[in-house]
Amino acid sequence: MMTGTIETTGNISAEKGGSIILQCHLSSTTAQVTQVNWEQQDQLLAICNADLGWHISPSFKDRVAPGPGLGLTLQSLTVNDTGEYFCIYHTYPDGTYTGRIFLEVLESSVAEHGARFQIP
């Protein structure tokens, strides 16, 4: 039975040209995290494997930095980066947990962070 929940940074906004940290946290389970995949729609951004470490997708190498922790830092943001991002936690023995973050990249200098929310 899957008892865990993923807490994410929720809906966030950031300025064009700036950077943002995408962060998820898995709680309420004793399952072992074996791998975390970061995806945008159906595109892979990066993977953090518990043993093999980080793998950054070639097309994002210049703009994605691993961490902090299991999170991901997006740099040199463009308006095209607006959209949904998913953290996919592979765990044993539970299986897969998915968290969703919506990022809006703003032209203006007014970019406020949204509230944290939970996905069961």
Partner: antibody, heavy 119, light 108 residues
Framework: QVQLVQSGAEVKKPGASVKVSCKVS????????MHWVRQAPGKGLEWMGG????????IYAQKFQGRVTMTEDTSTDTAYMELSSLRSEDTAVYYC????????????WGRGTLVTVSS | DIQMTQSPSSLSASVGDRVTITCRAS???????LAWYQQKPGKAPKLLLY???RLESGVPSRFSGSGSGTDYTLTISSLQPEDFATYYC?????????FGGGTKVEIK
């Protein structure tokens, strides 16, 4: 096209070590993790472990822990697998295989290297 | 470790037959990723399907996969002469990655 070229067949005595190489071409070596799978004569496939050429991170099957060492040389785009304390049961074809980490499957395989352990 | 039990271990079939091979995981743990390979004597395995049902580029559409949780199936809708080979499933949900024992498809 993408190719994994493995070193030639080896005959070893029990207790010895063997080091098998796998040279890649047709893609950027650091963009995939490289794994090793063996197959004893007439038997099934057995995963041994893998290495991330990006950072040298390794993952080994517990069965081989302490006996296997996987390394890479990014200057020559080559992965290596060394197995020590060889015994007759280690007689097998050893394959290197490129792993797609997103879905954990092997999309490209080497042709295999036969290692025979015999006194 | 999650053991993958493949059945049958061998089967005899004729060209044009529909063939189904199953793979069952030993643990109640969810298998996260499941792939299928074809191997011919003296050759390296060849990828057919990954992520349970995604067909590898260049693989004929007569091959299909399905399943979830602990039970998975490879189906060949109409067996062709070049399909006589041994088939392996492979799972990953944690270390170690494991393969099924194989299913040898022979000519009846």
């Amino acid at each position: 096209q993408v190719q994994l070229v493995q070193s030639g067949a080896e005959v070893k005595k029990p207790g010895a070590s063997v080091k098998v190489s796998c040279k890649v071409s047709g893609y950027t070596f650091t963009e995939y993790t490289m794994h090793w799978v063996r197959q004893a004569p007439g038997k099934g496939l057995e995963w041994m472990g893998g290495i991330n050429p990006n950072n040298g991170g390794t993952i080994y099957a517990q069965k081989f822990q302490g006996r296997v060492t996987m390394t890479e040389d990014t200057s020559t785009d080559t992965a290596y697998m060394e197995l020590s304390s060889l015994r007759s049961e280690d007689t097998a074809v050893y394959y290197c295989a490129r792993l797609v980490l997103r879905y954990w499957y092997f999309d490209v395989w080497g042709r295999g290297t036969l290692v025979t352990v015999s006194s | 470790d999650i053991q993958m039990t493949q059945s049958p271990s061998s089967l005899s079939a004729s060209v044009g037959d529909r063939v189904t091979i199953t793979c069952r995981a030993s643990a109640s743990s969810n298998v996260i990723y499941l792939a299928w390979y074809q191997q011919k004597p003296g050759k390296a395995p060849k990828l057919l399907l990954y992520d349970t049902s995604r067909l590898e580029s260049g693989v004929p559409s007569r091959f299909s996969g399905s399943g979830s949780g602990t039970d998975y199936t490879l189906t060949i809708s109409s067996l062709q002469p070049e399909d006589f080979a041994t088939y392996y499933c492979q799972q990953w949900s944690s270390n170690p990655l494991t393969f099924g024992g194989g299913t040898k498809v022979e000519i009846k």
